[in-house]
Structures are given as structure tokens and as C-alpha cells.
Amino acid sequence: APTSSSTKKTQLQLEHLLLDLQMILNGINNYKNPKLTRMLTFKFYMPKKATELKHLQCLEEELKPLEEVLNLAQSKNFHLRPRDLISNINVIVLELKGSETTFMCEYADETATIVEFLNRWITFCQSIISTLT
């Protein structure tokens, strides 16, 4: 059973992930970023279901494409280089989803733009955090 300290750790990791995703979204949504329009030509795959930490497998599988798109942005709105930012997210995702069980991600039929993709995972983090508090 999860202890209060492990729950707290999970909550802090989710909050860190949430902040990273929000930072990316704010960076690319900045109205001064002329690259956003071209970033919208990239497709991202969305999870059919995202209600548990194991579903973060679907986010992990899309991190490489996300990094490639962020490399386009050349944005001063990010404090870190895309490679470092995605690396940080990857570490958190791996810790949160755990590696004990291998979960096969199921994707929805509809794809998403980078903005829709980030919003979906931001909502996921907020939802899980709310169940922990």
C-alpha cells in the first residue's frame, strides 16, 4: 500500500512534470513565437485512456517527436535546451510510471497538434494530483 511519503513524492513529481509541460506550452503559445504556425503541422498521438500513472507510457513514447518539434522553436521562452528539458521530463515519467510492469500504450484514432497534446497531458497531471491531495 502506498505510504504517505511515497504519495507525497508522487505528488511532487507530478507537480514538477506539470510545470515542465506548462512551461513548454507557454513558450510555444507566446504570441511572439512565429514558429508556432509551422509547429502545428506535426502530428502527435494521444492515449485512448489516460487515468493512471501507467498510462504515462503513452507520453514517454511521444517525447522524442516532442523534442524534434521544440528544436524548431528556437525559442528564448525556454530556460533549457529542448534536449535537456525532454530529458528531465523523461526521468520524471520513468519514475512515475515505474518499470515493474510493461504497459502497451493504446492510442486514440484522432491525432493532435502540439498544443492539444500538451493540454491533454497537463489535464492528466492535474487530475492525478487532485486525487492525491
Epitope: 504570441y31 512565429p34 508556432l36 504556425t37 509551422r38 509547429m39 502545428l40 503541422t41 506535426f42 502530428k43 517527436p65 524534434e68 518539434v69 524548431l72 491525432t111 497538434t113
Partner: antibody, heavy 119, light 108 residues
Framework: QVQLVQSGAEVKKPGESLKISCKGS????????IGWVRQMPGKGLEWMGI????????RYSPSFQGQVTISADKSISTAYLQWSSLKASDTAMYYC????????????WGQGTMVTVSS | SYELTQPPSVSVSPGQMATITCSGD??????AYWYQQKSGQAPVLVIY???KRPSGISERFSGSSSGTVATLTITGAQVDDEADYYC???????????FGGGTKLTVL
């Protein structure tokens, strides 16, 4: 209303220079990419390149890099396509078009400028 | 350089379904857009982001994408739908875009 108005048809001789224009109105000209598209007689559409008038960031198709110059003057909301030395093979209809800010496709098109190069 | 491949022509009878395909290596990761160009006119966007319709475009136009192939479908084709149709997408660098060769749709 949002529109792009292009300069009139041109008839030129090989070796001459030319600059055609595309004036935007009804929207914030500096906040949208403007692209140029070529259509040779009886042929398909060819993407030539795009420019972001806000900072003049420009991208060219490899086929047109070095052959044409895309520029913009944001003070008069106008984009340009120019040639320093025209060839007969430049004879075509040239369209300018605006990239939508919300879904990255050309949503507004100019009426086209017919350029004829003949000796 | 990146290429999108379309059939040169498609013919259907009025009321039938017309299907136009577009294949490109980057399409699993890049959206396809479709333009209609009638004779002597500037192109008009009919589908964006694989399957979305801009406002003012008939519901008879739909789009889909699977793997490296994007598809434009016109249900209940009408004589007024006769036009050239072009798919459009961007290479994986995001810097360079390309039109397919175009497909002439004949409704007879």
C-alpha cells in the same frame, strides 16, 4: 475583410529583373507567414517559400533557393517576390497566400499575378 | 527533397463517391492539407489537419490519414466538384512544404 491583393500581370524579356507584390489588409500583417506558390501553364502548384513579415524570417524550397528572393515591407503590409534575371521558364501564374495562425495551411490567397517572359 | 504522390486523374459518375490518395514518407508524423482548384481560379482549402473541414466547406468533403497515405473523399460527387485537387504537407524539418502533383477529378 481579410484579403491579399497582388500586382498586375507582367510581360518581360529574358534577362530582365522583376519584383511583384502582395498587399495584405484586414489583419495583422506582421503576425502571419506569407507564402508564394508558382503554377506554370497547365501544370500543378509549387511551393516556393514563405516569409514571416514580423522579423523577415524566410524559408525557401530547394528548387527556388537562389533563383528568387522573397522579402516584405511591414510598414506597408506588403510581401514581394523578385527575380534578378528572368528566364522563359519563369513564365507562370504566381500566387501569394497567408498561412493560417491556427492550423498552418494557406487560408487566404491572392488573385494571382501572371508573369510572361518572352523575347 | 520531399515528395507527395497523387494519381493524375480520377473519374466518377454524379452521386458516386470519389477518393483521391496522397502518399508521402512523413505523413505518419505530418498533417496533410487538401486544396481544390477550379479552372482559372485560386486554390481553396477544403481539408486541414488530415480530416478537419474549414467553415463553409461542404460536409461531402472528408479526409483521413493512415500511415504514409492521406485520403480525400467526396461523397455524392457533383459536376460542380470537377477541379484539380492538391494535397499539401511539410517535411520533417518543418521548414519546407510541398504540394502533391495534383489530381484532376472528372464528374461525368
Amino acid at each position: 475583410q481579410v484579403q491579399l491583393v497582388q500586382s498586375g500581370a507582367e510581360v518581360k524579356k529574358p534577362g530582365e529583373s522583376l519584383k511583384i507584390s502582395c498587399k495584405g489588409s484586414g489583419y495583422s500583417f506582421t503576425s502571419y507567414w506569407i507564402g508564394w506558390v508558382r503554377q506554370m501553364p497547365g501544370k500543378g502548384l509549387e511551393w516556393m517559400g514563405i516569409i514571416y513579415p514580423g522579423d523577415s524570417d524566410t524559408r525557401y524550397s530547394p528548387s527556388f533557393q537562389g533563383q528568387v528572393t522573397i522579402s516584405a515591407d511591414k510598414s506597408i503590409s506588403t510581401a514581394y517576390l523578385q527575380w534578378s534575371s528572368l528566364k522563359a521558364s519563369d513564365t507562370a501564374m504566381y500566387y501569394c497566400a497567408r498561412l493560417s495562425g491556427s492550423y498552418s495551411a494557406f487560408d487566404i490567397w491572392g488573385q494571382g499575378t501572371m508573369v510572361t517572359v518572352s523575347s | 527533397s520531399y515528395e507527395l504522390t497523387q494519381p493524375p486523374s480520377v473519374s466518377v459518375s454524379p452521386g458516386q463517391m470519389a477518393t483521391i490518395t496522397c502518399s508521402g514518407d512523413a505523413l505518419p508524423r505530418k498533417y496533410a492539407y487538401w486544396y481544390q482548384q477550379k479552372s482559372g481560379q485560386a486554390p481553396v482549402l477544403v481539408i486541414y489537419e488530415d480530416s478537419k473541414r474549414p467553415s463553409g466547406i461542404s460536409e461531402r468533403f472528408s479526409g483521413s490519414s493512415s500511415g504514409t497515405v492521406a485520403t480525400l473523399t467526396i461523397t455524392g460527387a457533383q459536376v460542380d466538384d470537377e477541379a484539380d485537387y492538391y494535397c499539401f504537407s511539410t517535411d520533417l524539418s518543418g521548414d519546407r512544404s510541398v504540394f502533391g502533383g495534383g489530381t484532376k477529378l472528372t464528374v461525368l
